[in-house]
Interface confidence: medium
């Protein structure tokens, strides 16, 4: 047992320290007092603390804890927020390019179908964007609407251009005939399969990133309980009451306290690990028909093939439709019909010919690798916070919550704390309601991610030439199909380097923390993600 330090006969040091926390000295005793009203820093002898000081220490301790937690998650939060923004914008760029390729296909091959085709194409891709961002739109509806709208124009402009104006009331009949006679063959179904699979995966990917942000934001802004505040006060400030201003808490003691305070948060760990691994699985499956970049940029070719299919069968179709729609007197039409001009961005068409070294797919993989370094983020938090707050090295000559000890013993500390506070009780309370809610959301997204990941044992051959399919090669299983026999138009051999088009290149490695208010520990943040290497058997 080390000798007790000489008491501060005047509480002078305590007064000067406390004044930094709370201007004015009315709460600080001038000389040590019995402290019988204290509830947290229970004195073994005279103390320089009052009940009001104790309350202030508790408030400060909880604020410190919140700041430590926020600085701990800063790099991870930045990583996900920036990538969510990059991917959302990149997906919108893909949609814009896909629309322009398709419009260019119509302009180059079927000028008589413009501007009506431009409108239908524009609205189709608007719906694609809305779907990716979470709108409640049915992909089959989108594709049906596109072909329903296109067929009357194809019929009246390409197949039967001599049709008198008086016969143009047959549009509704033509829309119906489009489905009944399968005038585009299996192409609409092929496009539905490709577009729905690739967009579903894209949508869930964005949804998962946004949930990641929500998880971090939730734990970032946790309010710690009063019990935790008392434990933190005892660890960080009660030593001051005895005039021990320079003494640091024992490392082992800090870990016990942090595990108690963070018992609820640490419960997220299991679901967070699963979230990152499920997201990785999803990303690994995002190629060919599960990759919207690949599918949407090849769509113009499949649509072109579908129109060629109609033209090949024009003779037979014209006869059948002539009989079917000859007496149609319906003057109304389904809402998508009327032409509405859109423009082609010629600048974008040139992009297709550039060699592009960075694809969305490589960016996704890079994100996953960075996220995996945070796989142990939640289980490592207590240790991280202790390593970023003042603790005594090697647990020697340190504060154990009650007194200065030569060596920290967890058992002794727990026995000594029994009367003051039950750590086990704190753990048993279970997570905060907000933490429970976020765990439920993680469970839900993890389930979605698992169901969206490509079925095991059906991995597609990545080496197949994705432009090599003829429309007849699809067979019954359209999962294996990717559209587009050659049509002498724009060849999208290289996927676009979308990030070059983004107004900003948000790379986490370049991210300075200096746009935020600097805290004393900001310079240590960058080392945090390496904790994963230490704590995680999964890495």
């Amino acid at each position: 047992q080390p000798p007790p330090p000489p008491p501060d006969a005047t509480c002078h040091q305590v007064r000067s320290f406390f004044q930094r926390l709370q201007p004015g000295l009315k709460w600080v005793p001038e000389t040590p007092v019995p402290g019988s009203d204290l509830q947290v820093c229970l004195p073994k002898g005279p103390t320089c603390c009052s009940r009001k000081m104790e309350e202030k220490y508790q408030l400060t301790a909880r604020l410190n804890m919140e700041q430590l937690l926020q600085s701990a998650s800063m790099e991870l939060k930045f990583l996900i927020i920036q990538n969510a923004a990059v991917f959302q914008e990149a997906f919108e760029i893909v949609v814009r390019h896909a629309k322009n390729y398709t419009n260019a296909m119509f302009k180059n091959n079927y000028p008589s179908l413009t501007p009506q085709a431009f409108e239908f194409v524009g609205e189709f891709f608007t719906d694609v964007s809305l779907y990716i961002l979470g709108s409640d739109i049915n992909v089959d509806d989108m594709v049906n609407e596109l072909f329903d709208s296109l067929f009357p124009v194809i019929y009246t402009q390409l197949m039967n251009p001599g049709l008198p104006d008086s016969a143009l009331d047959i549009n509704e009949c033509l829309r119906g005939a489009r489905r009944d006679l399968k005038v585009f063959g299996n192409f609409p179904k092929l496009i539905m399969t490709q577009v729905s699979k690739s967009l579903q995966v894209t949508r869930i990917f964005l949804q998962a990133l946004n949930l990641g942000i929500e998880v971090i934001n939730t734990t970032d802004h946790l309010k710690f309980s009063k019990d935790c505040g008392r434990m933190l006060t005892r660890m960080w400030y009660c030593s001051y009451c005895q005039g021990l201003m320079m003494v640091k808490p024992c490392g082992g003691y800090c870990n016990v306290v942090m595990q108690g305070c963070m018992a609820g948060v640490v419960e997220i760990d299991k679901y967070w690990r699963e979230y990152i691994l499920s997201l990785e699985e999803l990303v690994n499956g995002m190629y060919r028909i599960y990759d919207m970049e690949n599918v949407l940029l090849g769509l113009f070719s499949t649509i072109h093939d579908s129109i060629q299919y109609v033209q090949k069968n024009a003779g037979k179709l014209t006869t059948t439709i002539g009989k079917l729609c000859a007496h149609s007197q319906q003057r109304q039409y389904r809402s998508a019909y009327y032409p509405e001009d859109l423009f082609i961005d010629k600048k974008v068409l040139k992009v297709a010919h550039v060699e592009h070294e960075e694809t969305l797919s490589s960016r996704r993989r890079e994100l996953i690798q960075k996220l995996k370094s945070f796989i142990s983020f939640y289980s490592a938090l207590p240790g991280y916070i202790c390593s970023h707050s003042p603790v005594a090295e090697n647990d020697t000559l340190c504060w154990n919550g009650q007194e200065l000890v030569e060596r920290y013993s967890q058992k002794a500390a727990r026995n000594g704390m029994k009367n003051q506070f039950n750590l086990h009780e704190l753990k048993m309370k279970g997570p905060e309601p907000v933490v429970s809610q976020i765990i439920d959301k993680l469970k839900h997204i993890n389930q979605l991610l698992r169901t969206m990941s490509m079925p095991k044992g059906r991995v597609l051959d990545k080496n197949l030439d994705e432009e090599g399919f003829e429309s007849g090669d699809c067979g019954d299983d359209e999962d294996e199909c990717i559209g587009g026999s050659g049509d002498g138009m724009i060849k999208v051999k290289n996927q676009l380097r979308f990030l070059a088009e983004l107004a900003y290149d948000l790379d986490v490695d370049d991210a300075p923390g200096n746009s935020q208010q600097a805290t004393p520990k900001d310079n240590e943040i960058s080392t945090f993600h390496n904790l994963g290497n230490v704590h995680s058997p999964l890495k």
Epitope: T126, D127, S335
Partner: antibody, heavy 121, light 107 residues
Framework: EVQLVESGPGLVKPSQTLSLTCTVS??????????WNWIRQHPGKGLEWIGY???????DYNPSLRSRLTISQDTSKNQFSLKLSSVTAADTAVYYC?????????????WGQGTMVTVSS | DVVLTQSPSSLSAFVGDRVTITCQAS??????LNWFQQKPGKAPKLLIY???TLETGVSSRFSGSGSGTHFNLVISSLEPEDSATYYC?????????FGQGTKLEIK
């Protein structure tokens, strides 16, 4: 938040032309993906769709009003307008402007507060 | 034009009651039917779109069902503020058309 505000004379003489303007804020009449509509409601009666204009300037009208109707837009002022010629007492109504998405999401999600127009000599 | 016929044209019910308003289309409009609520002197407010999807911010007491030619709007437990006229509207065909309205009065 998108806001639409109708403006125009509250009283029009029979056989004259009714002119109304809808000013849009929080959104652009020239951006793709939306139809900008006029709808009217006769006193104590149901709603009647009049027509819409698209960002390209293309229009679509209710066949029952087509011969008397012109809908146009002024993108510089972010406005679209309705002109209904040869009005009669039957055109007395509250006129609303409203927005809807172009195709699969075709419900009217934003409406103006409405402006009452009376046709009377 | 597609004619939408609402029934009843008016009804009176007590707070807490469950009411159903029906909209019949003269031809198949798939799922493309919306429901609006209109209070005196106000613009209509979207409640349900595409037959059954609740608009954001609308009370879950409102629900819609149906497809093709027959559609229902159900208010599960009436509140005083539900006193209004309710309209159905189709957006499958041009011209877009509305039902004649159902006036709901709370006793």
């Amino acid at each position: 938040e998108v806001q639409l505000v109708e403006s125009g004379p509250g009283l029009v003489k029979p056989s004259q032309t009714l002119s109304l303007t809808c000013t849009v804020s929080g959104g652009s009449v020239s951006s793709g993906g939306y139809h900008w509509n006029w709808i009217r409601q006769h006193p104590g009666k149901g709603l009647e769709w009049i027509g819409y204009i698209f960002n390209s300037g293309n229009t679509d009208y209710n066949p029952s009003l087509r011969s008397r109707l012109t809908i146009s837009q002024d993108t510089s002022k972010n406005q679209f307008s309705l002109k209904l010629s040869s009005v009669t007492a039957a055109d007395t109504a509250v006129y609303y402007c409203a927005r809807h998405r172009s195709r699969l999401l075709r419900w009217f999600d934003y409406w103006g507060q409405g402006t009452m127009v009376t046709v009377s000599s | 034009d597609v004619v939408l016929t609402q029934s009843p044209s008016s009804l009176s019910a007590f707070v807490g009651d469950r009411v159903t308003i029906t909209c019949q289309a003269s031809q198949d409009i798939r799922k493309y039917l919306n429901w609006f609520q209109q209070k005196p002197g106000k613009a209509p407010k979207l409640l349900i779109y595409d037959a059954s999807t609740l608009e954001t911010g609308v009370s879950s007491r409102f629900s819609g069902s149906g497809s093709g030619t027959h559609f229902n709007l159900v208010i599960s437990s009436l509140e005083p503020e539900d006193s209004a006229t309710y309209y159905c509207q189709q957006h499958d065909f041009v011209p877009r058309t509305f039902g004649q309205g159902t006036k709901l009065e709370i006793k």
